[in-house]
């Protein structure tokens, strides 16, 4: 059973993804952001469901194809380099799901924009937050 | 469907250049990121780099940083790879192929393959 | 750089057996993972992708499994068109690196 501990453990985790997937959000929605067209023709895949932390497997599988979407947008909308950025979220997403359990994700047929997808993960952490606390 | 055509078999000295070309037919270059992998001989498979052709960004593995220039133009759908300062062991087939975001979850892999270039390096 | 291991080098198998391919990754790499076949003076030709999904117009004898950063290609039934050499290959980080391929060949 989950100790009050690892709860706050990954309470803490999920408000860290949350606030890096809302800050790729912020810097893309950015009005100045010149790639925001093309961006918006990169097509992502949305899990058919996601109500637990194993199926952050469907986040991490597309994390590749967000790093290449946000290597087009000026590197002065984030913090940090994309490479970093994924590279921190990979790390936190692997916490929270675990690498033993090899879970395959599912996917919806109807594909997403980034706008759409990133939108769907803050969902999903919120959701998760809420009822951890 | 989608087509990459090379250009043809090249024979160079040791420490000459080689420009090899792949020209995308089916759908416009800009779609795709334009990769390339080579083979020596009887070896395996090597990355050198990809361009993204929309906007000219490159990325090169290390071993060939410095020698390598990837380039692509737009007008012909065509994507080039440049070697410079060539030894011996840089004879092997040279392939272009793609990776896209813009359609299917197969095409962010290698799913188009180039029939491959052979450069000879010897003197 | 992520080292993929491919087992064995050689495989010798006889049409109709069950053929198993390893490749093993040197860290985490999720489902990043895909399988080629090369045949001689050809081009390699894409099998699986995300560790799992057959590719398009792949005979469905051919599939893929993960176990942590073990990845398996096992073709069910060989057919005689499938002797050739296979490659893993990862995605999850530039550079991408091939493993350095099994042979299957006819006994």
């Known amino acids: 059973a989950p100790t009050s501990s690892s709860t706050k453990k990954t309470q803490l985790q999920l408000e860290h993804l949350l606030l890096d997937l809302q800050m790729i959000l912020n810097g893309i929605n950015n009005y100045k952001n010149p790639k925001l067209t093309r961006m918006l023709t990169f097509k992502f895949y949305m899990p058919k469901k996601a109500t637990e932390l194993k199926h952050l497997q469907c986040l991490e599988e597309e994390l590749g194809p967000l790093e290449e979407v946000l290597n087009l947008a000026q590197s002065k909308n984030f913090h940090l380099r994309p490479r970093d950025l994924i590279s921190n979220i990979r790390v936190i997403v692997l916490e929270l799901k675990g690498s033993e359990t090899t879970f395959m994700c599912e996917y919806a047929d109807e594909t997403a924009t980034i706008v759409e997808f990133l939108n769907r993960w803050i969902t999903f952490c919120q959701s998760i937050i809420s009822t951890l606390t | 469907q989608v087509q990459l055509v090379q250009s043809g078999a090249e024979v160079k000295k040791p420490g000459a250049t080689v420009k090899i070309s792949c020209k995308v037919s089916?759908?416009?270059?800009?779609?795709?990121?334009m990769h390339w992998v080579r083979q020596a001989p009887g070896q395996g498979l090597e990355w050198i780099g990809r361009?993204?052709?929309?906007?000219?960004?490159?990325k090169y593995a290390e071993n060939f940083k410095g020698r390598v220039t990837i380039t692509a133009d737009t007008s012909t759908d065509t994507a080039y790879m440049e070697l410079s300062s060539l030894r011996s062991e840089d004879t092997a087939v040279y392939y272009c192929?793609?990776?896209?975001?813009?359609?299917?979850?197969?095409?962010?892999?290698?799913?188009?393959w180039g029939q491959g270039t052979l450069v000879t390096v010897s003197s | 750089d992520i080292v993929l291991t491919q087992s064995p080098a050689t495989l010798s198998l006889s049409p109709g057996e069950r053929a198993t391919l390893s490749c093993q990754a040197s860290?985490?790499?999720?489902?990043?993972l895909s399988w080629y076949q090369q045949k001689p003076g050809q081009a390699p030709r894409l099998l699986i992708y995300?560790?799992?999904s057959l590719a398009s117009g792949i005979p469905a004898r051919f599939s893929g499994s993960r176990s942590g950063t073990d990845f398996t290609l096992t073709i069910s039934s060989l057919e005689p068109e499938d002797f050739a050499v296979y490659y893993c290959?990862?995605?999850?980080?530039?550079?991408?690196?091939f493993g350095q391929g099994t042979k299957l060949e006819i006994k």
């Open positions: 089916g759908d416009t270059i800009t779609a795709y990121y």
């Open positions: 290959l990862q995605h999850y980080s530039t550079p991408y690196t």
């Open positions: 192929t793609t990776v896209t975001f813009l359609y299917s979850r197969e095409l962010r892999w290698f799913a188009y």
């Open positions: 361009i993204d052709p929309e906007d000219d960004s490159t």
């Open positions: 995300s560790a799992t």
């Open positions: 860290q985490y790499i999720s489902n990043y």
